[in-house]
């Protein structure tokens, strides 16, 4: 008799793939333009990335540092109207993209929570949650919560409102903190909160350190669902050396939890790489005409158009990973086990019941390395085979689908491998 299938865990929509942050509508859409109506025209692109949710905004009226002139129920006319927003919601729904609204109150000011009149601010947030839930949004994001006093109690209250409306709604909180204790204390009072932080960016970017960061985080947060990013709002390129971008994309998509990206991460967009761009919101490079101020400043391989046509590009890798992440059970909700491998490497397995299993091997080092996989510290349920098929490599030159002998596995500098192998009873 075949062994009994393991019962599937309850899966919320944000468990099924990546979230994509558009913090600056105008920068995302390109120079001089950018509103909700225009964003609707970019939904096909987001669909092609297979992201499950769009974290949008803030979009509300906010007069810098003025609580009274901040209206979380009103869309700033520069971004469009409530009708434009409703249309965007409808179109996104048709494409199975959920919309999460950023309600960080004082986004134009220096202190995102005003650092004053917290009773008024909290009441405004509470009213806004109720209003926008009725309007049909799928969740909310609030950032910089380490600067909101009594953040835990407010988050608990806001989560109650969000989940009280529907368990299918999500609350995301962002913090600049990279301190695990602080992060855990924020998570403790909120069972379903998704927290983005700078935790992973406080790294020496070695295999050993990254492994230790990931395992400490997972141990500290127990069996709760995590999110993975390098910051609450910034681009990957702001935190990572360029040679590790592909490696981190592979890692973020294959760790147990929800990967969270900012617009441009998929093409390696750099903050302020081009003259006159604000550091926090560089213009998205759709094609070579995206930066008309300086002819020739943008080359094709920096753009969405150029990278879409190149199967070896970062964008193509992102799409491949996003596709795998959203359809493979082991990557969707599989168990996670790290195991010993060569110095400079971080290796782990994702497996779920009798489904195909995935092996991830990441070489953070500047030199080619023998993988030296040692499965002795793996549980019996997650043993390694002698061979596994290559799903993808972060570097060119390997043939996808080819079987690789794990004992003889060698990795190029900064190479990451995603391998698959079948369950064997």
């Amino acid at each position: 008799r075949a062994p009994r299938c393991r019962e599937l865990p309850a899966q919320k929509w944000w468990h099924t793939g990546a979230l994509y942050r558009i913090g600056d509508l105008q920068a995302f859409q390109g120079h001089g333009s950018g509103n909700l109506a225009g964003l609707k025209g970019r939904l096909d692109y987001l669909s092609s990335l297979k992201v499950k949710g769009l974290v949008l905004g803030p979009l509300h009226k906010n007069q810098k540092d003025d609580v009274a002139q901040t209206d979380l129920l009103q869309i700033d006319p520069n971004f469009g109207s409530k009708e434009d927003f409703d249309n965007l919601l409808q179109s996104a729904k048709k494409k199975s993209i959920r919309v999460i609204l950023d309600l960080t109150p004082n986004y134009r000011g220096e202190n995102l929570w005003f650092s004053t009149q917290v009773d008024s601010v909290a009441t405004k947030v509470k009213d806004a949650l109720e209003f926008w839930l009725q309007a049909g949004v799928d969740g909310f994001q609030v950032r910089d919560i380490e600067n909101l006093k009594d953040a835990s109690s407010f988050l608990a209250e806001w989560e109650n409102i969000t989940k009280g409306f529907s368990e299918d709604r999500l609350l995301i909180a962002g913090t600049n903190s990279s301190d695990l204790q602080q992060i855990v204390s924020l998570l403790e009072s909120n069972k379903d909160l998704l927290l983005t932080s700078s935790y992973l960016s406080d790294s020496s970017f070695t295999g050993e350190h990254t492994k230790s960061l990931v395992t400490q985080y997972l141990n500290a947060t127990g069996n709760r669902w995590c999110s993975w990013s390098l910051s609450q709002a910034g681009l990957l390129t702001s935190f990572l050396p360029a040679q590790l971008l592909r490696l981190y994309q592979l890692m973020l998509f294959t760790l147990p939890g929800t990967p969270v990206f900012s617009y441009g991460d998929e093409i390696g967009l750099k903050a302020a790489a081009l003259p006159g761009q604000p550091v926090e919101a560089p213009v998205m490079l759709w094609d070579e005409s995206s930066f008309p101020d300086i002819p020739g400043a943008v080359s094709a391989n920096m753009t969405v158009k150029g990278q879409s046509e190149d199967p070896g590009s970062l964008l193509s890798l992102f799409r491949q990973l996003s596709d795998q992440r959203s359809k493979e059970r082991s990557l969707l909700h599989g168990d996670f086990h790290t195991f010993s491998s060569g110095p400079g490497l971080f290796s782990y397995i994702r497996h779920w019941d009798q489904n195909e299993r995935f092996l991830v091997v990441l070489n953070f080092g500047d030199v080619g390395l023998s993988a030296g996989l040692q499965a002795s510290d793996l549980p019996a349920s997650a043993s390694l085979p002698t061979k596994a098929d290559l799903v993808l490599s972060t570097q060119p030159g390997r043939e996808e689908g080819s079987p690789l002998e794990l004992e003889r596995l060698k990795l190029e500098p900064h190479e990451g491998l995603l391998l698959r192998f079948p369950y064997v009873a």
Epitope: D65, N111, S115, T116, Q117, D119, A122, E146, K149, S153
Partner: antibody
């Protein structure tokens, strides 16, 4: 116009009790955190207690020096905040102000509490 | 508890001169700092909250600055009506605490 008016102060013996009231008008009382702050020549301005909103389960916080002796409460239907003071001591003497918000954007004129034998 | 220290208890400044009053917190208070002005016989009046945000109706000669543990109240050109005692208060964590006050008089 925002108005806060304290009452209930006076002379009381050590060990005695007293209740202060503060009636508010000119703003949405039920949406505002309320505080009691006292002032004496010896200690200067000293925050005493805070009460939050119904949605915060009327959470209260107290200065260490009054914990277990003073109780802050509110009646949103009457736009009134109270401070019940028990087991009063000489060092509790001072002017007691109620203030609205966080920090106190509006203050009453204060009521004098004198604890003396 | 977070202690708030105002280094000067008294300041004597000539009319029209710039005044700087400092306040130091014993721990980080993330800009959750207020400045109050109190004149004899009156309740304190909020001038600045969030370390830098000027309350409505407060003259623009008043300004606040600082972050972390160190904060400053400045008056660009001292006027007669500015004679008062100035207090800082942290309201980042309970118990909220006030500084000891700085009494400002005209030289």
């Amino acid at each position: 116009e925002v108005k806060l008016e304290e009452s209930g102060g006076g002379l009381v013996q050590p060990g005695g009790s007293m209740i202060l009231s503060c009636v508010a008008s000119g703003f949405t009382f039920s949406n505002s955190w309320m505080n009691w702050v006292r002032q004496s020549p010896e200690k200067g301005l000293e925050w005493v207690a805070e009460i939050r909103l119904r949605s915060n389960n009327y959470a209260t916080h107290y200065a260490e020096s009054v914990k277990g002796r003073f109780t802050i409460s509110r009646d949103d239907s009457k736009s009134t905040v109270y401070l019940q003071m028990n087991n009063l001591r000489a060092e509790d003497t001072g002017i007691y102000y109620c203030s609205r918000g966080d920090p106190g954007a509006y203050w009453g004129q204060g009521t004098l509490v004198t604890v003396s034998a | 508890d977070i202690q708030m220290t105002q280094s000067s208890s008294y300041l004597s400044v000539s009319l029209g001169n710039r005044v700087t009053i400092t306040c130091k917190a014993s721990d980080h208070i993330k800009n959750w700092l207020a400045w109050f002005q109190q004149k004899p016989g009156n309740a304190p009046r909020l001038l600045i909250s969030g370390a830098t945000i000027l309350e409505t109706g407060v003259p623009s000669r008043f300004s606040g600055s600082g972050s972390g543990k160190d904060y400053t109240l400045s008056i660009t050109s001292l006027q007669t009506e500015d004679v008062a005692t100035y207090y800082c208060q942290q309201y980042w964590s309970t118990p909220y605490t006030f500084g000891g006050g700085t009494k400002l008089e005209i030289k």
